[in-house]
């Protein structure tokens, strides 16, 4: 409506005697600025005067006159939009209607605001959520329809008269829409808070009590239970009886059902607050609790651990670990269900009691093959002795023991024989699955653990075998002791160290590398002729005639072996020189005559010298001296000399006769 002034402010404001009131207010005049403002208390319109009558609490006019009340009442507004007011202190008789008479140049308006002032501070109001459940956070709200800048207040929360630990958040509102002070408290109630009194207390700035509001907490919670048991320690023996009683200490709302649980599983047909267990068995040992439900949910008591005591049950043995390897450690554990736990144990190995072993565990630090067998035990507690169970088998695994290599052949073994060996052992766990032989060869294994060596070599000295399961055990090597004829027979010159010269002392040695058996005989041979039976062949003074091809033989009981032929070479100076003439020692002049210097020498003659009958050396150095044409003057005695590295040799004289030819004779 464009003909109205527009105001915004709270409809009613609340306060109490001695406090103050702050009235937030805004307006919009129809035209121009505010020229006059009067605050009336309970104004009434006088039709006669066309004016408002009533107590004037505040007046602002053009002439500036201000009534005495103006100190208590303050107009905090302005000429065009703010109409905020403050009354401090406020009195009980201020209750009623406040009238704001506003006048501009051409328009007038009366705006009414309700003021409710009580004699004493009025209580705040606690607001609770519709339902409170244990452990679920709720917000408690304390609301007071009051706030004033000139009168500070505080709201405090109490639980059963004791200030609450939780921090509250206080907020105030002084707006044209609302005026209030609010405290919010976040709180997680427990079941024990059910029925407790919560108070919101209004206090002044000094903490002096002004008023309060109280509520009783209705905390919905699952039933809270206590379990009682006879016997109190819940330790019984088989055949005893046990009573458990479930007591509900609190439930909101009321409980509806009750049940009993053992180890988390519901017990059938047990729906009363007492659980009677008659003549209990060990199977009834376990954790018991009662469960009572209401609309919130189920509540459970603490658990009672029922222990039914009984003598040990037949025991079983656990072995860590079987099969065990010889030398390793093994632990035996005697397992027997018993309550109380067994205090004493008796251990048996293959039915025989193991002395001094009374613990639950038996530890053998170094296991040996004889430890194998059946282990059993008997457990004992205060209620009796259990039975011996079936026991457990300890399998001790070890490498094959006492492995030997055995030669099956009759002795001695000769080179070339077929040799059979077997690999034997004393015991093994697990069983032997394969065999190994050293040294390796292209040999036959006709069956497991048997080795056949065809055409055994002279050098097959030792053989060792291993029997293998998970491990290999080697036997000591066995000597084959193969017998064979002497080997590598050869002729070796012992002296002289250099070449053999005629007349030297010469020694030849018959060598061989090996022989088995060692006893041997020697034979020397030259051109098929036996020369001696010693290992050495000696020449005191060698002659060229001793040169030739020599062999030695070595024999033992197995056979004989010959050396390769060895050539004996004798070095000597030229000898047996002679001059031969061709075509003869008588030659016709004019013909050709050839003189040859023949010799025996080793090494062969390297240099020849010719001499005439006057011992005059001739200028010829080859083996042949050729005279062509021969002259009568050539007649005479000739000789030659041969030279090699050893020395010189000289021939006897040989006479050449040159006769005249018929022509010469004819001319004469």
């Amino acid at each position: 409506d464009s003909s109205k002034w527009v105001f915004e402010h709270p409809e009613t404001l609340y306060a109490w005697e001695g406090a103050c009131v702050w009235i937030p207010c805004t307006y919009r005049a129809l035209d121009g600025d505010l020229e006059s403002f009067i605050l009336f208390h309970n104004p009434e319109y006088n039709k006669n005067t066309s004016k408002f009558d009533g107590t004037r609490l505040y007046e602002s006019t053009k002439d500036g006159k201000v009534p005495s009340e103006q100190k208590r009442v303050q107009f905090l507004g302005d000429k065009n939009k703010n109409c905020t007011l403050s009354i401090h202190p406020v009195h009980l008789n201020d209750s009623g209607q406040l009238g704001l008479r506003m006048e501009s140049k051409t328009e007038k308006w009366m705006e009414r605001i309700h003021l409710n002032v009580s004699e004493r501070p009025f209580p705040p109001h606690i607001q609770l959520p519709p339902e409170i459940q244990e452990s679920q956070e709720v917000t408690l709200t304390c609301l007071l329809n009051f706030s004033c800048y000139g009168y500070p207040i505080q709201l405090q929360w109490l639980l059963e008269g004791v200030p609450m630990r939780q921090a509250a958040v206080t907020s105030t509102s002084l707006t044209i829409k609302s005026v209030f002070t609010r405290s919010e408290l976040k709180f997680s109630p427990q079941w024990s808070h059910h029925g407790k009194i919560v108070t919101c207390q209004l206090q002044d700035a000094d903490g002096k009590f002004l008023s309060n509001d109280t509520v009783q907490l209705n905390v919905k919670h699952t039933p809270k239970l206590e379990i009682k048991v006879t016997p109190s320690d819940a330790i019984v023996r088989e055949g005893d009886s046990v009573t458990m009683t479930c007591e509900v200490s609190s439930s909101n709302p009321e409980y509806t059902t009750v049940s009993w649980l053992k180890d988390g599983t519901s017990l059938k047909k047990q729906n009363t607050f007492t659980l009677n267990l008659r003549e209990v068995t060990k199977d009834q040992s376990g954790k018991y609790c009662c469960q009572v439900s209401n609309d919130v949910g189920p509540g459970r008591s603490e658990e009672v651990f029922l222990q039914v005591q009984y003598a040990p049950e037949p025991s079983t043995v656990q072995i860590l670990h079987s099969p065990a390897v010889e030398g390793s450690q093994v632990e035996f554990l005697c397992m027997s269900l018993a309550n109380p736990l067994p205090t004493n144990y008796t251990w048996y190995h293959n039915g025989k009691e193991m002395q001094g072993r009374t613990e639950e565990k038996v530890h053998i630090p170094k296991i040996l093959p004889w430890h194998a067998g059946t282990y059993s035990c008997v457990a004992e507690n205060i209620l009796g002795t259990g039975q011996r169970g079936p026991g457990a088998e300890l399998d001790v695994q070890y490498p094959p023991k006492k492995v030997t290599t055995v030669i099956q052949n009759p002795m001695p073994i000769r080179e070339g024989d077929t040799v059979t060996l077997s690999c034997n052992y004393n015991s093994s766990n697990p069983s032997v699955t394969r065999y190994e032989w050293k040294p390796h060869g292209a040999w036959e294994e006709p069956s497991l653990g048997v080795l056949k060596i065809q055409n055994v070599g002279w050098d097959n000295t030792t053989i060792a075998c291993a029997a293998c399961n998970s491990w290999c055990s080697w036997a000591s090597p066995v000597a084959l002791n193969v017998q064979y004829a002497p080997r590598d027979v050869r002729v070796r010159k012992i002296k002289p160290l250099s070449e053999i010269h005629s007349g030297n002392s010469v020694s030849l040695q018959c060598d061989f590398s090996s022989s088995h058996p060692k006893e041997v005989q020697f034979f020397w041979e030259k051109n098929g002729r036996l020369l001696g039976k010693e290992s050495q062949l000696n020449f005191d003074s060698i002659s060229p005639e001793d040169a030739g091809s020599y062999s030695c033989w070595v024999n033992n009981s197995i056979g004989q072996t010959a050396s390769k032929a060895w050539t004996l070479e004798v070095l000597y100076a030229p000898r047996r020189l002679r001059v031969s003439m061709s075509p003869g020692d008588q030659v016709m002049e004019g013909k050709s005559a050839t003189l040859t210097c023949e010799s025996d020498a080793n090494p062969p003659v390297s240099h020849y010298t010719w001499f005439d009958w006057n011992n005059q050396s001739l200028p010829y150095h080859s083996q042949k001296l050729r005279l062509e044409p021969v002259k009568v003057q050539h007649s005479g005695a000739y000789w030659c000399q041969g030279t090699n590295s050893v020395g010189k040799g000289r021939s006897p004289l040989s006479t050449l006769t040159v006769y005249y030819s018929p022509e010469t004779i004819g001319r004469r």
């Epitope: 009682k228 048991v229 006879t230 016997p231 109190s232 320690d233 330790i235 019984v236 023996r237 055949g239 005893d240 009886s241 046990v242 009573t243 009683t245 007591e247 007492t274 009677n276 008659r278 003549e279 209990v280 005591q309």
Partner: antibody, heavy 127, light 112 residues
């Protein structure tokens, strides 16, 4: 109405045998109650004597001092419990109460509280 | 066997008084304790069992507390009908530790 009524001779000669009977009405002997005897010598305190499980097992329990001389038994058909005491002496003079008990027992020991009592019968041992 | 020791043996009190009777067990009996009231010439009456559970029909001025070996019976405001002798009794048992029912010697509450 659940009630217990004791009956007995009143006067017994020393070295004689005392026999007491407790008639139980409104009590289910198959339920988990024990039937017991408690005595009270004149001007003295209460002494528990013995209990019996009236259910089929009929297991009996005795105070250590009562073993051997007292015998508790039941007659389920009549819902009766009896107590016999041999070789009585003046020290056995007492008011003997029959009581219904609630609790547990085993291996000769019992733990129970007495929620229902008979009015008691006075037994005097005198020549 | 278990031995129950009550104290005091006699207690003088006035109507409206708060009365406390204690009972000590020679072994740990958990919460297995009962309290009885006996008036002259009458059979005992069960007041409390399991140390703190009120028997049916017993006024709430009677309360029990304790566990293990120390127990207390409290009458918050003594009434004329409460002058009597009170007995504690172990209703725990143990087949393992060999004990069962046992009564205390009694406490006589008389008018001061």
């Amino acid at each position: 109405e659940v009630q217990l009524q004791e009956s007995g001779p009143g006067l017994v000669k020393p070295s004689g045998t005392l026999s007491l009977t407790c008639a139980a009405s409104g009590i289910d002997f198959s339920s988990y109650y024990y039937m017991c005897w408690v005595r009270q010598p004149p001007g003295k305190g209460l002494e528990w004597v013995a209990c019996i499980d009236p259910a089929s097992s009929g297991t009996t329990y005795y105070a250590t001092w009562a073993k051997g001389r007292f015998t508790i038994s039941k007659d389920s058909s009549k819902t009766q419990v009896s107590l016999k005491l041999s070789s009585v002496t003046a020290a056995d003079t007492a008011v003997y109460y029959c009581a219904r008990a609630y609790g547990s027992g085993g291996s000769g020991y019992i733990g129970c509280y007495f929620d229902l009592w008979g009015q008691g019968t006075l037994v005097t041992v005198s020549s | 066997d278990i031995v129950m020791t009550q104290s005091p043996s006699t207690l003088s009190a006035s109507v409206g008084d708060r009365v406390t009777i204690t009972c000590q067990a020679s072994q740990n009996i958990g919460s297995g304790l009962a309290w009885y009231q006996q008036k002259p010439g009458k059979a005992p009456k069960l007041l409390i069992y399991y140390a703190s559970t009120l028997a049916s029909g017993v006024p709430s001025r009677f309360s029990g507390s304790g566990s293990g070996t120390q127990f207390t019976l409290t009458i918050s405001s003594l009434q004329p009908d409460d002058f009597a002798t009170y007995y504690c009794q172990s209703h725990d048992y143990s087949s393992v530790r060999s004990y069962g029912n046992a009564f205390g010697g009694g406490t006589k509450v008389e008018i001061k």
